[in-house]
Interface confidence: low
Amino acid sequence: LPAQVAFTPYAPEPGSTCRLREYYDQTAQMCCSKCSPGQHAKVFCTKTSDTVCDSCEDSTYTQLWNWVPECLSCGSRCSSDQVETQACTREQNRICTCRPGWYCALSKQEGCRLCAPLRKCRPGFGVARPGTETSDVVCKPCAPGTFSNTTSSTDICRPHQICNVVAIPGNASMDAVCTSTSPTRSMAPGAVHLPQPVSTRSQHTQPTPEPSTAPSTSFLLPMGPSPPAEGSTGD
């Protein structure tokens, strides 16, 4: 004869455990039904009656089979620097992620607790390491022969154009300006240039690294936007 299927609540055999989606109630000393995701235990089981489940109220949820007396509260609304990528439902918590141009400086189990703006590299500095969802942009001074004339969280240092005759030499924050004869674009930084009879390499002024390019002592918010030049208040 096949073994008889036990219906909850039932007393488990000594040394055995309750089945999947059941839990052992210490008070009743019985195996009882868990509540499904989106529900919670309204009334716990007894020796003669099974768990009574009820739906989660608005703005609360349970994600797993459970026997909790109250559903969990959904997290607070996403802040203005975040995007809601998963809405609060009876079965799942709200998930907030950082909006474009920001990164997660302090994550939580799902989503982000604290977003910070991606650092922008100022003219004379280019992106050495792009920002990700969880890390800030790292800027570096443009090496000789390269420049960046933008304030950007994505622009890298670009090579100066090579002029037959230089009108204005390039520097870290400005491309070389050639005289009316058409320039030839230089190759990538570090590439070998074939000697040109009339080519004049544009001079390059190395920028002084800003305070924000130094490694930060902060483990939580490693970097932010680059500070303005000392003393320049713009007022």
Epitope: S79, S80, D81, Q82, L114, C115, A116, P117, P211, S212, S216, S218, F219, L220, L221, P222, M223, G224, P225, P227, P228, S232, T233, G234, D235
Partner: antibody, heavy 124, light 110 residues
Framework: EVQLVESGGGLIQPGGSLRLSCAAS????????VSWVRQAPGKGLEWIGA???????YYSNWAKSRFTISRDNSKNTLYLQMNSLRAEDTAVYYC??????????????????WGRGTLVTVSS | DIQLTQSPSFLSASVGDRVTITCQVS??????LSWYQQKPGKAPKLLIY???TLASGVPSRFSGSGSGTEFTLTISSLQPEDFATYYC????????????FGGGTKVEIK
């Protein structure tokens, strides 16, 4: 001349609403992060919120429900709408901007330009 | 909430004294801290930004240091015009802010 001038303060009854203005001259408000800061008589500075150059508003936790910051770029003016006013909202209200044009939310490099402030008195 | 705690709240000092005010922040803010001076009936004046950069027109006797959560404002030799209230302000955290300013430190004549 680069300056900020607040207006719209005065005596208001508890529960009432008031809109303060902050007119900018000598620079474009739309390219700056500008904050509202208040100071109750004999008390410290209290940050209310700000609007970034990108147009995003930021608020302190206590101000979120009753205060709204907006901007009219055509008038080069910032506004602070205050609702359900209470006696404890009595203060001098200042607008202040970052010392550099930046799309950083507020005060990353301090607030280098301040208005003279406008007094709001909430009393019956 | 992020909290900025200034100490001391009151400070009595004499002209020529070296004065130090500290600002403790409950969360790391990298170097995004500013210091202000305020005199009665006047708007605050920016002294230092980015923790240690002197604002335009501010005397060199004022200096700032620190990063992360601990910051210091130092006045190397107190002058008669320096008797005022000083505030620190964070400009990095944008969500869950109670107040971006510290409680203030009043520097009085001894």
């Amino acid at each position: 001349e680069v300056q900020l001038v607040e207006s719209g303060g005065g005596l208001i009854q508890p529960g009432g609403s008031l809109r303060l203005s902050c007119a900018a001259s000598g620079f474009s408000l739309s390219s700056s992060a500008v904050s509202w800061v208040r100071q109750a008589p004999g008390k410290g500075l209290e940050w209310i919120g700000a609007i970034g150059s990108g147009g995003t508003s930021y608020y302190s936790n206590w101000a979120k429900s009753r205060f709204t910051i907006s901007r009219d770029n055509s008038k080069n003016t910032l506004y602070l709408q205050m609702n359900s006013l209470r006696a404890e909202d009595t203060a001098v209200y200042y607008c202040a901007r970052d010392p550099n044009s930046s799309d950083y939310p507020y005060g990353a490099y301090g607030m280098g330009l301040w208005g003279r402030g406008t007094l709001v008195t909430v009393s019956s | 909430d992020i909290q900025l705690t200034q100490s001391p709240s009151f400070l009595s000092a004499s002209v020529g004294d070296r004065v130090t005010i500290t600002c403790q922040v409950s969360q790391s803010i990298s170097s995004y801290l500013s210091w202000y001076q305020q005199k009665p009936g006047k708007a605050p004046k920016l002294l230092i930004y980015y923790a240690s950069t002197l604002a335009s027109g501010v005397p060199s006797r004022f200096s700032g240091s620190g990063s992360g959560t601990e910051f210091t404002l130092t006045i190397s030799s107190l002058q008669p015009e320096d008797f005022a209230t000083y505030y620190c302000q964070q400009g990095y955290i944008t969500s869950n802010v109670g107040n971006a300013f510290g409680g203030g430190t009043k520097v009085e004549i001894k």
